[in-house]
């Protein structure tokens, strides 16, 4: 059964709701470790940008896993990095990301905490349209461990429309996760962090080149969905997870049969959150249109465990907790394609706040 995020508002429900649709049994008050990285003051204004990465690393115990370090010293035993360029980055040293790319210190960064009561219902946000995502086994696709995530490179022909005249083509997809006992999604909802998150990265058809689009409003669009535990195995994800052992080493790349990419996303493409942010890793380019689906994707406990323990990253450390702390909204509004706010009225709120990719 599809599970939605909006069930987290009000009283948490357990098991099946009266509608027969599972709702998330999530405490409204988040635990300390999953608290929003930037608590907004009551007047609705975002605070000055304060990086709470130290607090985040303390609460996650990251000091035991990957010590923050300057990018130029982060290669460990992997050989020399000559030249003065700051090119290495790690999740243990996100405070140093602006040295790698100044855009990482920008005001409109991702990920963010989606606070349901502050979302603006926007009727103009239509269901997404995906075309050509059901790939055949041939040609095969590249699956790689780049030291930061597992990435599936997608072939030409996967088309997506955010709305009329806003067409994109899929470039790649990748995942973010935690450990067996700590969730690792990038976005959070009311401070709640999910076990994992999938990102499908798209390039606007207005640009022929990725680097033309970087930093341009609407140049890139990412579809994001939360992965959540359920009793049943997800057969679509098994087509990826079954190959992780083959790319356990950092830098590994293999070819796997093509698969139905749409099956990796929720079935309900009509209920989602929308905001403008950035890439969540260096170069942290802004102008990225984010679509975060309300419905979660279900994986078995074994599958989530496989995701979190199969890959290795730099310096012979497990590739885990590969998520960036949530970033301040700094005045941005998160729009919802459905009335997600707890006190939402039948009338659309902030209907004029709806933006169009490229505005």
């Amino acid at each position: 059964q599809p599970q939605g995020l909006s069930g987290m508002q009000g009283e948490p429900s357990l098991g099946d709701s009266s509608s027969g649709e599972d709702e998330l049994g999530v405490d409204v008050l988040p635990s300390e470790e999953d608290a929003p990285e930037e608590a907004d003051p009551p007047d609705g204004e975002d605070p000055p940008e304060v990086n709470s990465e130290d607090r985040m690393e303390e609460s996650l115990g990251l000091e035991d896993l990957s010590t923050p370090e300057a990018p130029e010293h982060s290669q460990g035993s992997h050989g020399d990095e000559k030249g003065g360029g700051h090119s290495h980055w790690s999740y243990g040293g996100t405070l140093l990301w602006p040295q790698v790319s100044p855009a990482c210190a920008g005001r409109f960064q991702s990920p963010v905490d989606i606070r349901l009561e502050r979302t603006a219902f926007c009727r103009t946000l239509q269901p997404l349209e995906l075309l050509g995502y059901e790939l055949q086994p041939l040609p095969e696709l590249s699956l790689s461990n780049n030291g930061h995530t597992v990435q599936l490179t997608l072939p030409p022909g996967l088309k997506m429309a955010l709305g009329p005249g806003q067409e994109y083509r899929a470039l790649q997809l990748h995942l973010h996760w935690g450990t067996s006992d700590h969730p690792g999604s990038e976005h959070t909802v009311n401070g709640h962090r999910f076990p994992a998150e999938i990102h499908v990265v798209h390039l606007s058809t207005a640009f022929s080149e990725l680097h033309e689009a970087l930093g341009r409003p609407g140049g890139l669009a990412v579809l994001a969905a939360f992965l959540q535990e359920s009793p049943e195995e997800n057969s679509a994800y098994e087509q990826l997870l079954s190959h992780l052992e083959e790319i356990s080493e950092e830098g590994s790349k293999i070819e796997i049969p093509g698969l139905d990419v749409s099956a990796l996303l929720p079935s309900d493409l009509s209920r989602y959150y929308r905001y403008e942010g950035s890439l969540t890793t260096p170069p942290c380019s802004q102008g990225v249109i984010w679509t975060v689906f309300n419905e979660t994707v279900k994986l078995s406990a074994k599958q989530l465990h496989t995701l979190s323990v199969s890959l290795w990253g730099p310096r012979d450390s497990r590739l885990q907790l590969n998520f960036r702390a949530t970033q301040p909204l700094n005045g941005r509004t998160i729009e919802a394609s459905f009335p997600a706010a707890e006190d939402s009225s039948p009338e659309p709120v902030h209907v004029n706040s709806c933006f169009t990719a490229g505005d």
Epitope: G79, S87, N146, H148, H211, E250, P283
Partner: nanobody, 117 residues
């Protein structure tokens, strides 16, 4: 437009050395700072083969056939990735291609390396 350009190929005797260079041009962002960069090779009548990879963390990986003889490194300041090839063998003869993988794949045109006496 991002362009990758390989250089350094040529004729070399068995047991000799050669250094290949891959330079990126035309991009607003230093692609080698954010991309996993690999060298591939393709011998006549054979499939393209992954030779060496360097990730953005500085991690390196080599195919079994070149381990201990080839070294991949990155010079982000000069926006180049190097492949130092030592103890070359006739079976290393191939066209060598540079590949940068950041959100999308970028390929160079290739440079021919011939190992022959």
């Amino acid at each position: 437009q991002v362009q990758l350009q390989e250089s350094g190929g040529g004729l070399v005797q068995p047991g000799g050395s050669r250094r290949l260079s891959c330079a990126a041009s035309g991009n607003s962002v230093n692609i080698f700072s954010f991309a996993a960069v690999a060298w591939y090779r393709q011998a006549p009548g054979k499939q393209r083969e992954l030779v060496a990879v360097i990730t953005t963390t500085g991690g390196t990986k080599y195919s079994d056939s070149v381990k201990g003889r080839f070294t991949i490194s990155r010079d982000s300041a000069k926006n180049t990735v190097l492949l130092q090839m030592n103890s070359l063998k006739p079976e290393d003869t191939a066209v060598y291609y540079c590949n940068a993988d950041y959100l999308q794949d970028y390929w160079g045109q290739g440079t021919q390396v011939t190992v022959s006496s």
